[in-house]
Amino acid sequence: CKAMHVAQPAVVLASSRGIASFVCEYASPGKATEVRVTVLRQADSQVTEVCAATYMMGNELTFLDDSICTGTSSGNQVNLTIQGLRAMDTGLYICKVELMYPPPYYLGIGNGTQIYVIDPEPCPDSDF
């Protein structure tokens, strides 16, 4: 047994359309067949769950229909995309990975990705 390490980028800038993508990579100590990935947002010492998905290794990652997250998995790497972000959503987004099955259970928590969101300036009215 050894601890599970989770890596994610330190900083990501959301696009002008409010979309941010980052990779969450974990060093699996065991042969997990079922993995749960959760994105947590930490801002002003408050923690909220942004989204979560459980997937079987080799299968696609599926979030709930109303989730603001989408993602794909490849081996021990998860590509996460968060949409609909606004300036007020700027904060630290933490990737949490749990190896659910088979036992033993493993938990790994990344250091977080600081996502900066800048609301686009409204287009100036045209005089034409």
């Epitope: 047994c1 769950e49 099955y101």
Partner: antibody, heavy 118, light 108 residues
Framework: QVQLVESGGGVVQPGSSLRLSCAAS????????MHWVRQAPGKGLEWVAV????????HYADSVKGRFTTSRDNSKNTLHLQMNSLRAEDTAVYFC???????????WGQGTLVTVSS | EIVLTQSPGTLSLSPGERATLSCRAS???????LAWYQQKPGQAPRLLIY???SRATGIPDRFSGSGSGTDFTLTISRLEPEDFAVYYC?????????FGPGTKVDIK
Amino acid sequence: QVQLVESGGGVVQPGSSLRLSCAASGFTFSSHGMHWVRQAPGKGLEWVAVIWYDGSNKHYADSVKGRFTTSRDNSKNTLHLQMNSLRAEDTAVYFCARGGYFGCFDSWGQGTLVTVSS
Amino acid sequence: EIVLTQSPGTLSLSPGERATLSCRASQSVSSSCLAWYQQKPGQAPRLLIYGASSRATGIPDRFSGSGSGTDFTLTISRLEPEDFAVYYCQQYGISPFTFGPGTKVDIK
């Protein structure tokens, strides 16, 4: 605020069964793993079992494996621990605890005492 | 399973003094997955520190945690009367989740 209330403890004979319950309120129950931890009189804390999120995955301490079963009803915000083939060494205060977003046990119930004695 | 050892078993100190509690793991523990709890007689445990060094909500800043790998420390900078209790470390990164045997901090 988060509240966890255990019930179902009591005095039973060795070999018998008991079902503990934990009523949860003040948070989104299905978003958290739920744990059982016990404490024998005058002793330290011992983790007993966990049931994750939708209830499909459970893990147990070796000392209770095959005898104890945990379950949850997310529609009723309730956690259960079915204890069979009870032994004297199962005598303890049983706590339910919420697994926080970061995995630590961030909220605990007040505990319910189970005494196994002939 | 990961075995946690705490030392000393009992720490006798006076209010205002500094308390240093140690927790050692039998194998490396992710610092993200190490917690400290306080328990007073007849009460449930209370989370103090998670992730080795992050204070739980409402915990005074006289409590601090540090360490990595196999060695972790809980420090209480100036003991208040309400701090005399039993303190447990716990790892929650790998099942079975395990607690240390506890350190009792009592009044000298």
